[in-house]
């Protein structure tokens, strides 16, 4: 069962930046994860395996990202108020079949304390 | 918990047409359901409630549809091979909060026996 709601803390703030956590079930072997801001693709990461089980990781829209066995984290830096928006993790699951897509998201609120360069 | 996978029979064939079943949790009171073919919006249906709890159903992209307390069915007729594609149920949940979006889908395979007008 693929859970399509972000029932975890999706946004983790540190040092004027934010880590956006996109989880997937650990049974998933091959997938594409896109980070959407509104309807726009900001970042993506695709993990696939070839016929000899060798892993390939590719990014068409490159962001600083971090891959674990059940999540992809995308990092946004130098936060300002324009970053406030709905962000979605768009997960396409290739393996195990059948092909599935889930979109999970939440609103990124930007508070004064989280901005990278606060006016003193 | 909103389940984002189509872990049910999404496509039901009858009389040369197909019923595409888009499920949602029965706790959901207000929502928008869109049927996407690839990335294109084919149909939509929005259910909202006014201040007196009056229900409003509206469609911007109208298709023959059927609403129950946990699903929206969209009906496509006169199937031909061009209908074969990935179809997605794009559910935006307004109530209960928080706002969530889930996209669930599958591939619609068109076999000879399902076409509306087979050559004899």
């Amino acid at each position: 069962e693929i859970n399509g709601s972000a029932n975890y803390e999706m946004f983790i703030f540190h040092n004027g930046g934010v880590q956006i956590l996109c989880k997937y079930p650990d049974i998933v072997q091959q997938f594409k994860m896109q980070l959407l801001k509104g309807g726009q693709i900001l970042c993506d990461l695709t993990k696939t395996k070839g016929s000899g089980n060798k892993v390939s990781i590719k990014s068409l829209k490159f962001c600083h990202s971090q891959l674990s066995n059940n999540s992809v984290s995308f990092f946004l830096y130098n936060l300002d108020r324009s970053h406030a928006n709905y962000y979605f993790c768009n997960l396409s699951i290739f393996d195990p079949p059948p092909f599935k897509v889930t979109l999970t998201g939440g609103y990124l609120h930007i508070y004064e304390s989280q901005l990278c360069c606060q006016l003193k | 918990e909103i389940n984002g996978s189509a872990n049910y029979e999404m496509f039901i064939f009858h009389n040369g047409g197909v019923q595409i079943l888009c499920k949602y949790p029965d706790i959901v009171q207000q929502f928008k359901m869109q049927l996407l073919k690839g990335g294109q919006i084919l149909c939509d249906l929005t259910k909202t409630k006014g201040s007196g709890n009056k229900v409003s159903i509206k469609s911007l992209k109208f298709c023959h549809s059927q609403l129950s307390n946990n699903s929206v069915s969209f009906f496509l007729y006169n199937l031909d091979r061009s209908h074969a594609n990935y179809y997605f149920c794009n559910l935006s949940i307004f109530d209960p909060p928080p706002f969530k979006v889930t996209l669930t889908g599958g591939y619609l395979h068109i076999y000879e026996s399902q076409l509306c007008c087979q050559l004899k």
Partner: antibody, heavy 117, light 111 residues
Amino acid sequence: EVQLVESGGGLVKPGGSLKLSCAASGFTFSDYWMDWVRQAPGKGLEWVGNIDHDGNIINFAPSVKGRFTISRDNAKNTLYLQMNSVKSEDTATYYCARWGHYAFDSWGQGTLVTVSS
Amino acid sequence: DIVMTQSPSSLAVSAGDKVTINCKSSQSLLSSGYNYLIWYQQKTGQAPKLLIFYASTRHTGVPDRFIGSGSGTDFTLTITSFQTEDLGDYYCQHHYSSPPTFGPGTKLEIK
């Protein structure tokens, strides 16, 4: 509809070279690993090699390593097999196949390569 | 390299027969709950066609008379009621590691 069409086969002398092509259509070519598989006349299937989405990872069977190279042009939706220093045991029908994440789900019709003097 | 073996190498069958083809790997193909084993059918003069992946999952459009089973190192393809259109060669293949290798094949012929 997914289509894979091989070309470039023919008669080649031992020690010679040949380049096979596979034109892909009906799917997003750059989303898939692609493979070459061969079949000697009257024999079974033998994997030749594969290439990932953008050509960063290429693997070969021990029998062709150092002699064959695989490349792809995603702009042209085309897969290539460059065969050098060919031997008589390379005589086979060469298939290009799409690796559909967990199996070869689409195959071309094959192109015959005959190595003979 | 993982070595794949198949038995029998050929089999004469009649319409309606239950057919069993065996495939054995030199090491376990089980990983993360999945068996990395595939079955293909190849008819004379044609390219192979995918039948079964992950040892037991039928590919789209494959008739339900084709059943894949087994785990670890021992696998079976069963045709519950052979039809004449099922004539041809059947190959198993692993994708557990590189290189992926095929079994030598099993030829089904009419009795």
